[in-house]
């Protein structure tokens, strides 16, 4: 099984390899098989990454940053494989690697350009700040700088705030959008062009529901087919907003098909879950159940947020007692 990395072939004996932060990659190099094989891998023409000759590794003068991180495919050297297996790449490893191979027949030099990308799964959050409502798309660690786009009711929004924090390794990015008083649906897309990876967050506000005390409420939550892939691991969380913060009512993990319920009056229909319908029921409503309910369906590629506003009113019976 090869680690996650892909090669882009470009002219002049030069290849581009794209790897992910902290994952293993292979820097490819091949040669016409011959005896007396000498292999030297160097970084930026200066630092010794790996040396092999006279049938074994010679790492005495290897640059310390590569210690215990490199190896060759020793059983494949006689077949013309001088590729380097490179463990746990970091952004500091980006750059040009040169592979020198000498044999009894010839000397060849291959260049490999290593580019490293980072894309820790982004999140879409719904926040209340005083009387304002915000949607925030954020990614804790991303490299290179991503492209973030917002849409309202499928129409691109030009206004796009981006709060960026740069660290040695990568960027941390927040993109907030004020949605106070809006009933529109919103979509945020974060794209890492290097890793060719896109994440989408979608927010939908459902019509408000008015219920009487002691009744039950059914709140719908069905993923949009455009994003949802049942084969991919995902998590569903139902939360209730109370005094500006969300408390988790229940969650479901697709990988284990486990449902954890924190609120005894909450119920999920197992059959509906099997049909990828995560609608829920809340029984025996009381006045304090009024508020916003958030369904969050999240995977590595998307977050789907559905907001329901529930108003619980006193029943006639209760009103007449008062």
């Amino acid at each position: 099984i090869f680690p996650l990395a892909f090669f882009i072939y470009v002219p002049m004996n030069e290849q581009i390899v794209i790897g992910r932060l902290d994952e293993d990659i292979i820097l490819p190099s091949s040669f016409e098989r011959g005896s007396e094989v000498v292999i030297h891998w160097k970084y930026q023409d200066s630092y010794k990454v790996h040396s092999y000759y006279k049938g074994s590794d010679h790492l005495e003068s290897q640059d310390p940053r590569y210690a215990n991180r490199t190896s060759l495919f020793y059983n494949e050297i006689q077949n013309g494989n001088a590729s380097l297996f490179f463990r746990r790449v970091s952004l500091l490893d980006e750059g040009i690697y040169t592979c020198y191979v000498g044999t009894a027949i010839q000397v060849i030099t291959n260049k490999v350009v290593l580019k490293v990308g980072v894309f820790l799964t982004p999140v879409m959050k719904y926040e209340k700040r005083n009387t304002n409502s915000f949607l925030i798309c954020s990614v804790l660690s991303v490299y290179p700088r991503p492209i973030i786009t917002w849409k309202m009711d499928n129409t691109p929004i030009s206004e796009n705030n981006m709060e960026e924090t740069g660290s040695l390794d990568s960027f941390s990015i927040n993109s907030p959008l004020n949605i106070t008083g809006s009933n529109s649906s919103y979509e945020c897309t974060i794209e890492n062009s290097l890793l060719k990876q896109t994440w989408t967050g979608r927010w939908t506000m459902k019509d408000g529901l008015h219920k009487m005390q002691s009744e039950h409420v059914s709140l719908s939550c069905q993923p949009v087919n455009d994003y949802f892939s049942p084969n991919q691991d995902f998590k569903v969380t139902w939360s209730r907003m109370k005094s500006g913060t969300f408390s988790v009512l229940a969650y479901y993990l697709s990988s284990s098909q486990n449902t954890i319920i924190n609120e005894s009056r909450f119920s999920w229909n197992k059959e509906l879950i099997n049909q990828s319908d995560f609608s829920m029921n809340l029984m025996d409503l009381n006045l304090s159940d009024s508020g916003e309910y958030l369904c969050n369906i999240s995977s590595d590629e998307y977050t789907l947020l559905t907001i329901h506003t529930v108003h619980v009113e006193p029943s006639q019976e209760t009103a007449s007692h008062n």
Epitope: K54, G102, V107
Partner: antibody, heavy 121, light 107 residues
């Protein structure tokens, strides 16, 4: 065809310095390690020093370490041996010789014709 | 340093003879051994590398064998052109060292 031509030999007094050169042609100079090997008159061969293809590594025989310095200029296809604090026992024909590849293998595929260094008072 | 000892120091043989020169290392050098031929007034010439691999362009009457500490160079049928001194050389580790040479004379 591969050619290595040494120059710079001559007669020098003990304690003095001399610089030998080796001009290379017929191959991609920057791909190969080059060695200096010497042979005292009527005696056997003695390896002196090696410099790798990219000049990243240089190694010397114990008998010359600290006195001789090997260097190369890949843009000019030339190799040099700076010899300081010369001794009578350094008298020899000095050959430059090309390694099989980078300099790491350590045997000599092509040789120059040699240049004679005589250290005498 | 690894010492290399060649025997004999001189050898006299007739054209057509099978000639064997021996080289001993003071410690194991695996197969990292080369043989050279040096004719009078000339630079040495590589014959054999890695103990038994024949260098390109070298006549097939030359062959090498051995590993560890004991090595031999064999000329299967001596030719007048083979008049020369022969050297073994270890390249297992720095410093690279040569045998003292075997002078081959034609009877």
């Amino acid at each position: 065809q591969v050619q290595l031509v040494e120059s710079g030999g001559g007669v020098v007094q003990p304690g003095r310095s001399l610089r030998l050169s080796c001009a290379a042609s017929g191959f991609t100079f920057s791909d190969y390690g080059i060695h200096w090997v010497r042979q005292a008159p009527g005696k056997g061969l003695e390896w002196v020093a090696v410099i790798w293809y990219d000049a990243s590594d240089k190694y010397y025989a114990d008998s010359v370490r600290g006195r001789f310095t090997i260097s190369r200029d890949n843009s000019k296809n030339t190799l040099s041996l700076q010899m300081n604090s010369l001794r009578v026992e350094d008298t020899a024909v000095y050959y430059c010789a090309r390694d099989r590849s980078s300099g790491a293998m350590g045997y000599f595929v092509y040789w120059g014709q040699g240049t004679l260094v005589t250290v005498s008072s | 340093d690894i010492q290399m000892t060649q025997s004999p120091s001189t050898l006299s043989a007739s054209v057509g003879d099978r000639v064997t020169i021996t080289c001993r290392a003071s410690q194991s050098i695996s197969s990292w051994l080369a043989w050279y031929q040096q004719k009078p007034g000339k630079a040495p010439k590589l014959l054999i590398y890695k103990a038994s691999s024949l260098e390109s362009g070298v006549p097939s009457r030359f062959s090498g064998s051995g590993s560890g500490t004991e090595f031999t160079l064999t000329i299967s049928s001596l030719q007048p052109d083979d008049l020369a001194t022969y050297y073994c050389q270890q390249y297992q580790s720095y410093s690279y060292t040569f045998g003292q040479g075997t002078k081959l004379e034609i009877k």
